[in-house]
């Protein structure tokens, strides 16, 4: 607590402005009149403040709205926001994408902290959804925004959505968070052509099942190795080498570099060794002609 | 990472003048641009502060004689120091607020002899 004391004559301040860097703590304190400071909060990120000269200017605005600040003055804290916890942002109520944007301004090429992480889950409650726009503004700060959710998270995400969604958004998502996002892509993207389709679904492929990937091996889509790479090893396994001939195109020779590696050690320990000897890499590993292979999946089931 | 490049201090005889400048690299906006002093055993303290408007302020002990003003277009800061008194003798820091975050300059020494 800031004792109370009387404000010196003339001292009383009648604007927000750079002079009030010059008063003591105590003086800002008795000064300083809380409303007048919260219809001029804008003009506080001009000001270089000391961080004990903040913590006065958020003690006053804490007194003046003790059940949490108004948008009209979360809108404008800039780097205020950085003296803010985040049990003081539970208790607000941020509905417009402009009060987000400035508040991310602020920590603009910092890692997510507490407080941005607990203000983009109070905004994306409030919405209900992560809509669009709003992906798009936190992907556009958090390239990696995306892969910190939670499936449960995800579901919430719209396919429409999606269109927001760049390539890079995605490299630190895993398998469970793919497996959600997925089908939303394919929802998203299915009336485009063949191979806009496949530019557009690439990034999101870590999620495909088999079917899918035996359909797009009908399309001539050419996939490089590295999408090859992060599809789900259960989803590879069950495809052909045909097939997979036909998923990579021209960069079929790149299984041979891969050939150690998941998924394609444990798709290749799958094929008849006849059959991966037409791809003519000299691929090793695959079962020797003349040995039955057992699902022993498909036995389990029926037994 | 903002660098801050002060320049301009030096010793000087009580009654002179002195020009301190202070330039950063930031291609961020800047807020405001200021300088603080910290005599021997003394805490740091703000001098004068210029902000994105040009409005300017000044520590009471300074007013009418240091005047500080601002190069936009070189992002530079200048502090004109006239009528220095040995109580002026500190180290000159330049601050700069830039996209929401201070920065603080390696300071420069200023010294007035009686």
């Known amino acids: 607590e800031v004792e109370k004391t009387a404000c010196p004559s003339g001292k009383k301040a009648r604007e927000i402005d750079e002079s009030l860097i010059f008063y003591k703590k105590w003086e800002l304190e008795a000064c300083v009149d809380a409303a007048l400071l919260a219809t001029q909060m804008d003009r506080v990120n001009a000001i270089p403040f000391t961080y004990e000269q903040l913590d006065v200017l958020k003690h006053k605005l804490d007194e003046l709205y003790p059940q949490g600040y108004p948008e009209s003055v979360i809108q404008h804290l800039g780097y205020l926001f950085l003296k803010m916890s985040p049990e003081d942002i539970r208790k607000w109520n941020v509905t417009s994408l402009e009060t987000l944007k400035a508040l991310l301004e602020v920590n603009k090429g910092h890692e997510m902290s507490p407080q941005v992480a607990t203000l983009i889950d109070r905004f994306v409650k409030g919405r209900g959804q992560l809509d669009k726009d709003t992906l798009d503004t936190l992907t556009a700060f958090y390239p990696g925004y995306l892969c910190s959710l939670s499936p449960e998270e995800l579901s919430s995400v719209p396919p429409s959505s999606i269109w927001a969604v760049r390539p890079q958004d995605l490299d630190t998502c895993d398998p469970r968070q793919l497996d959600v996002l997925y089908p939303k892509a394919r929802l998203a993207f299915q009336n485009m052509n063949g191979s806009e389709y496949f530019v557009k679904i690439q990034s999101f492929l870590g999620g495909a099942p088999t079917e899918d990937l035996k359909a797009l091996s009908q399309q001539n889509v050419s996939m490089d190795l590295a999408t090859f790479m992060k599809l789900r090893t259960d989803a590879v396994l069950p495809l052909t080498v045909a097939e997979v001939q036909k998923l990579l195109g021209p960069h079929v020779e790149g299984l041979k570099a891969e050939e150690r590696h998941r998924p394609v050690r444990d798709w290749i320990l799958r094929q008849r060794q006849d059959d991966l000897d037409t791809l003519g890499l000299g691929l090793q590993g695959g079962i020797p002609n003349g040995y039955l292979v057992l699902d022993l999946s498909m036995q389990e089931a029926l037994s | 990472q903002v660098q801050l490049v002060e320049s301009g201090g030096g010793l000087v005889q009580a009654g002179g003048s002195l020009r301190l400048s202070c330039t950063t690299s930031?291609?961020?906006?800047?807020?405001?641009m200021s300088w603080y002093r910290q005599a021997p055993g003394n805490q740091r303290e703000p001098v004068a502060v210029?902000?994105?408007?040009?409005?300017?302020s000044y520590a009471d002990s300074v007013k009418g004689r240091f005047t500080i003003s601002r190069d936009n277009a070189r992002n530079t800061v200048y502090l004109q120091m006239d009528s220095l008194k040995p109580e002026d003798t500190a180290i000159y820091t330049c601050?700069?607020?830039?996209?929401?975050?201070?920065?603080w300059g390696q300071g420069t020494q200023v010294t007035v002899s009686s």
């Open positions: 930031t291609t961020f906006s800047i807020n405001s």
């Open positions: 210029i902000t994105n408007r040009g409005t300017t």
């Open positions: 601050h700069v607020i830039a996209d929401w975050r201070g920065y």
